[in-house]
Interface confidence: low
């Protein structure tokens, strides 16, 4: 399927708003600092230079690979140089080497201020005023903030923004009417990058063959019906899709997950009953839809694994004839009739089965050897089981912020060489798994729980990567991508840790602290606890308890008096040394 | 479904070099990875080759540096150059072909290798 110009074709298929829109966000991907301006200026350049090659596909330069004319295209940036550093050097290679070398470049945490959110009557004159560059603003902000966005999943986004604006900008109350919509978009945002940015570390870290094992375990619990030829073509289209997203070929990666919904709702008979009222909705929400859709029901008649997987004496012969085969039926298999298990533990389970076949196809009497292999995997579902179980008591008992703050406890311990920063919001978003799982029947539990915390560890290797301090926390990101949350729950306080020096000035509060939200009040304590456990990592809960019990006393005081900084100014001192004193 | 024919197989001296072809048929859009299995009388189905549709490839260390393998996509074909055969080599010679995994099999050619 050659195209005599890859740029003409993608601009046909696409069309001029999407095509426009994936431009935008894979420019502002990897140029993040670079002005909203220069990247729409950039943007329309080559927009214009697609139309001449949809008109006439053998003119100069319409041959070229994308690659070459997006990297030809960022390349002309007079500020490069200063603006980006190093990053400049990519422009003297060649592709593919320039591609590969703006990716490297990618900055998963960039030094770009907190977006403010303005009046809402401001937002609707600047979207009445003009909605086509409002909404490429949104595109941009949000691309440059999250690197590894699933680009056609942020137009979908775009999508819903101007439908926000559309529909509250003309309501009588609109703040009441906009304010939730955008809150929503956020936080669905944030969730919708950490789980992109672990698809990306999947395949750039591990290999496609740990993506395309995730994804049969993942797509064999949504399409139990599903054949299993037919789940390895879903899976195979997929990982190519986020291969491409995951390296900047956003328009080819757009394309192509068009392709997949279109044969999706195409063969619904074969994979699903619940993709009907997907297949109705136009194609960015149909793909959002579909990607979304809740599992199937599990045919009634599925008989046991152990037939085909452990009493048959063909299993070792199965097994070397083709092994991923038969490790990809198994896992097909066993992940359809268990919806109720995370990913990450059907992974564990195909990984020890793997294991023990390796060992077992080389003994003396194979058949004897694996004949108990089901009963090996039954710690390794009871580990998960028991960590959530645990956990949910927890967080019933104390409620989300304080939940958070025992694992911001827990975390520091196990890693205190961890800029205070990631801690707090590492272990802010694991707190929030009690929120978002532990209402959910048991069934639901460990899929939602596990496989949450892996999107948000992921989150702290990749942070990590960016600026190593702690061998732990390397060992357990690189060396096993399904045992990373195991790895990170067997972690114990680290002995070898030299406790931080005291800092007051970590500690010395202002009267700001009153005018702030409660989140950000929220976020301050943390720190402070943080730092708190930095300095006495053998503290005890009692003793961490009375600090911030005190300290949240401490500031309520304070935002009372009629003199807040005089307040703070004299209680602080105070409250530092009552903390030490504790502490001793 | 997939249908993979496979030719070239015969009889060699040692040291000779043969080329096995494959060519798919059928759904073939889905097909990403291509390989070569060999089965010797009484022994167990060895992996041989195996090339992506990318063009990565992964020999074992047996045929590492003697076989390569090199695929025609326009033409669905893959190949398989065997050169410095030995007695050893000799088996049926199957090719396998799959999105995700080798799942396609093709009925097999004999290759023998004399000494």
């Known amino acids: 399927d050659t195209h005599k110009s890859e740029v003409a074709h993608r601009f046909k298929d696409l069309g001029e708003e999407h095509f426009k829109g994936l431009v935008l966000v894979a420019f502002s991907q990897y140029l993040q600092q670079c002005p909203f301006e220069e990247h729409v200026k950039l943007v329309n350049e080559v927009t214009e230079f697609a139309k001449t090659c949809v008109a006439d596909e053998s003119a100069e330069n319409c041959d070229k690979s994308l690659h070459t004319l997006f990297g030809d295209k960022l390349c002309t940036v007079a500020t490069l140089r200063e603006t980006y550093g190093e990053m400049a050097d990519c422009c003297a290679k060649q592709e593919p080497e320039r591609n590969e070398c703006f990716l490297q470049h990618k900055d998963d945490n960039p030094n770009l201020p907190p977006l403010v959110r303005p009046e809402v009557d401001v937002m609707c004159t600047a979207f009445h005023d003009n909605e086509a560059t409002f909404l490429k603003k949104y595109l941009y902000e949000v691309a440059r903030r999250h690197p590894y966005f699933y680009a056609p999943e942020l137009l979908f986004f775009a999508a819903r923004y101007k439908a926000a604006f559309a529909e509250c900008c003309q309501a009588a109350d609109k703040a009441a009417c906009l304010l939730p919509k955008l809150d929503e978009l956020r936080d669905e945002g944030k969730a919708s990058s950490a789980k992109q940015r672990l698809k990306c570390a999947s395949l750039q870290k591990f290999g496609d063959r740990a993506f395309k094992a995730w994804a049969v375990a993942r797509l064999s619990q949504k399409f139990p019906k599903a054949e299993f030829a037919e789940v390895s073509k879903l899976v195979t289209d997929l990982t190519k899709v986020h291969t491409e997203c995951c390296h900047g070929d956003l328009l080819e990666c757009a394309d192509d997950r068009a392709d997949l919904a279109k044969y999706m709702c195409e063969n619904q008979d074969s994979i699903s009953s619940k993709l009907k009222e997907c297949c109705d909705k136009p194609l960015l929400e149909k793909s959002h839809c579909l990607a979304e859709v809740e599992n199937d029901e599990m045919p009634a008649d599925l008989p046991s694994l152990a037939a085909d997987y452990v009493e048959s004496k063909d299993v070792c012969k199965n097994y070397a004839e083709a092994k991923d085969v038969f490790l990809g039926m198994f896992l097909y298999e066993y992940a359809r009739r268990h919806p109720d298990y995370s990913v990450m533990l059907l992974l564990r389970l195909a990984k020890a089965y793997e294991a023990t076949l390796e060992k077992c196809c080389a003994a003396a009497d194979p058949h004897e050897c694996y004949a108990k292999v089901f009963d090996e995997f039954q710690p390794l579902v009871e580990e998960p089981q028991n960590l959530v179980k645990q956990n949910c008591e927890l967080f019933e008992q104390l409620g989300e912020y304080k939940f958070q703050n025992a694992l911001l406890v827990r975390y520091t311990k196990k890693v205190p060489q961890v800029s205070t920063p990631t801690l707090v919001e590492v272990s802010r978003n694991l707190g929030k798994v009690g929120a978002k799982c532990c209402k959910l029947p048991e069934a639901k539990r460990m899929p939602c729980a596990e496989d949450y915390l892996s999107v948000v560890l992921n989150r702290l290797c990749v942070l990590h990567e960016k600026t190593p301090v702690s061998e732990k926390v390397t060992k357990c990101c690189t060396e096993s991508l399904v045992n990373r949350r195991p790895c990170f729950s067997a972690l114990e306080l680290d002995e070898a840790y030299v406790p931080k020096a005291f800092n007051a000035e970590t500690f010395t509060f202002h009267a700001d602290m009153c005018t702030l939200s409660e989140k950000e009040k929220q976020v301050k304590k943390q720190t402070a606890l943080v730092e708190l456990v930095k300095h006495k990592p053998k503290a005890t809960k009692e003793q961490l308890k009375g600090v911030m019990d005190n300290f949240a006393a401490f500031v309520e005081k304070c935002c009372k008096a009629d003199d807040k900084e005089a307040c703070f100014a004299e209680e602080g001192p105070k409250f530092v040394a009552a903390s030490q004193a504790a502490l001793a | 479904q997939v249908q993979l024919v496979e030719s070239g197989g015969g009889l060699v001296q040692a040291g000779g070099s043969l080329r096995l072809s494959c060519t798919a048929s059928?759904?073939?859009?889905?097909?990403?990875?291509m390989a070569w299995y060999r089965q010797a009388p009484g022994q167990q189905r060895e992996f041989v080759a195996r090339i992506s549709k990318g063009g990565s490839t992964n020999y074992p260390d047996s045929v590492k540096g003697r076989f390569t393998i090199s695929r025609d996509n326009a033409k669905n074909t893959v190949y398989l150059q065997m050169n410095s055969l030995k007695p050893e080599d000799t088996a049926v010679y199957y090719c396998a072909a799959g999105p995700v995994w080798e799942q396609f099999w093709g009925q097999g050619t004999q290759v023998t290798v004399s000494s």
């Open positions: 059928g759904s073939i859009e889905s097909i990403n990875r």
